[in-house]
Amino acid sequence: KFSKQSWGLENEALIVRCPRQGKPSYTVDWYYSQTNKSIPTQERNRVFASGQLLKFLPAEVADSGIYTCIVRSPTFNRTGYANVTIYKKQSDCNVPDYLMYSTVSGSEKNSKIYCPTIDLYNWTAPLEWFKNCQALQGSRYRAHKSFLVIDNVMTEDAGDYTCKFIHNENGANYSVTATRSFTVKDEQGFSLFPVIGAPAQNEIKEVEIGKNANLTCSACFGKGTQFLAAVLWQLNGTKITDFGEPRIQQEEGQNQSFSNGLACLDMVLRIADVKEEDLLLQYDCLALNLHGLRRHTVRLSRKN
C-alpha cells in the first residue's frame, strides 16, 4: 500500500518523497533496504535524506534499489518503501515507456500539461518544453508556472511532452527532465436539431446550359462525435440513386469541424452538362439526425 516506484536518468537530480507521509514535524529516517544501512542527512553527500525527501544529486545507475523510510509518528513508526530505478541516458530521441509518467488528456477548453514531480524540486521559471524531442516554439505554446498551455488544441498536438528544468541545491544546479504523453479528446458532445448552413431555403442557383454545376448541402448537428447524422440530396422527392440520371451524382464532402466546435457535414451534388430539363427539377438538401429532418429547397435558373 505504501510502496512507490520512482525513476530518473543518470547525471540528473532525482528527489523521492516517502510514500508514507506524516506531518511536517515528524522525523523521517531513511535506509537502504538491502543493507539496512542508514542514509546520511548531511548535504555534502551525493545521496542524502532531508525529512520526507530522499535526494540523489545527481543520480547514478548504481543507486537503483529499494529504500525504506520510517516515519516517527506517534504510537507507531510507520514504514514506506521507495523503489528507485536510475536509467542510462538514451542516445536517440525515443523516450521508452518505463520513463513515462501518467498520460494526460486535453481538449479545446483545457490543455494544461503539468510537469511531473516538479513540486519536489527547488526550481525557478521558466520551464523548457519539448515535443518528441523538438523544442516547442510559437505563440500557441505558453510555459506557465509548472505547466504548459497549448492554445487551440488540435489532434496533431497529441504526443510525448518533456519538461526540463534546473534544481538548485545549496548553489549547485542539477538538470531534471520528465516526460508524459498527451492525448486530445473531444469535449463532451451534444446534438441538436440539424441546422442547414447552405443552401438557403428556396435559393435560386444560376447555371449555364452545357456547363457543369455543383450544389453543396452543408449542415451542422451539434458538438463532438455524433451518433447519427447525415446530409443528402433528393430530386423531386426521390433519392439520387433512384432518380436514374447518370449526369447527376452526389459525393460526400469532408467532415467539418468549424472554429465554433460544431460537428458539420457536406454533401456535393454534381450536375454534368446542365440541360434545359434540369431547370424544371426541385433540388432538396436534407439534413437528418435523431432530432429530426430539415429540408432546404433549391431551384436552378438560366444564367443570362
Partner: antibody, heavy 122, light 111 residues
Framework: EVQLVESGGGLVQPGGSLRLSCAAS????????MHWVRQTTGKGLEWVSA???????YYPGSVKGRFTISREDAKNSLYLQMNSLRAGDTAVYYC????????????????WGQGTTVTVSS | DIVMTQSPLSLPVTPGEPASISCRSS???????????LDWYLQKPGQSPQLLIY???NRASGVPDRFSGSGSGTDFTLNISRVEAEDVGVYYC????????FGGGTKVEIK
Amino acid sequence: EVQLVESGGGLVQPGGSLRLSCAASGFTFSTYDMHWVRQTTGKGLEWVSAIDLAGDTYYPGSVKGRFTISREDAKNSLYLQMNSLRAGDTAVYYCARGGDGYNYDYYGIDVWGQGTTVTVSS
Amino acid sequence: DIVMTQSPLSLPVTPGEPASISCRSSQSLLHSDGYHYLDWYLQKPGQSPQLLIYLGSNRASGVPDRFSGSGSGTDFTLNISRVEAEDVGVYYCMQALQTLTFGGGTKVEIK
C-alpha cells in the same frame, strides 16, 4: 452511532487457537488505526496488538509470533487470530479505535467494544 | 518499552470534594509534533473503558468539565474538581507515544 462489537470468545485448551472478530459501524473504518486490548480478571489493561490503515501490524513481546491481527476494510471488520494459547491469555478482549492514520489525527482511544471473554483452561 | 506508574492505588473520595491522580512515565511523552501522548480513561464497574482526556489536557467529547488533565514531560495529573457518585471506578493513564502502555490503575471509591 459509532460502535464496535466483538465476538468469537470462548473456552479453549492450552495450545489451542481462537479467532476474535470485531464489527465496526458508524465511521470510516479504513482510515483508522485499530487495537486489541485485554483485561485479566481483577487486573489492569494490557495492549495486545494494533494494525494501521496500511495493514502494518504491531505487537508486544508477550504475544509476538502467537497472535496475528488483520483487517478487512470492505467488511468493516477487525480480527485477532490467537494461536498457542496459554492460561495467561485468559482475559476479556476489547476491540478499540485508535487515531486517524490517514490524517495523523489522534483523539485518544475513543471507541471501545463491550469485550469478549477468552478462557484458556484444560 | 515505556513504563507507566500510577498513584495512589486506591483513592477514597467524598462527593463534592476535589480529587487528583498522578501518573509518571519512564520517559518523556513529548513528541516532535509538540503534543504529549498521554490519555486518561475511566472504567466504571462492569463497563468497558471510556476516554476522558487525550493528549495530556484535552477533554473528550461528552466529558464533564469537572475533569481536567495537566502535566508535561514525564509527570501528569488528572484532576476532578468536585467528585460525584457516578465518578467511581478505576482510572487508567495510558501513553500512546510508542505503541500503548497503561498504568496500573487507581480505584476511586466513595468514602
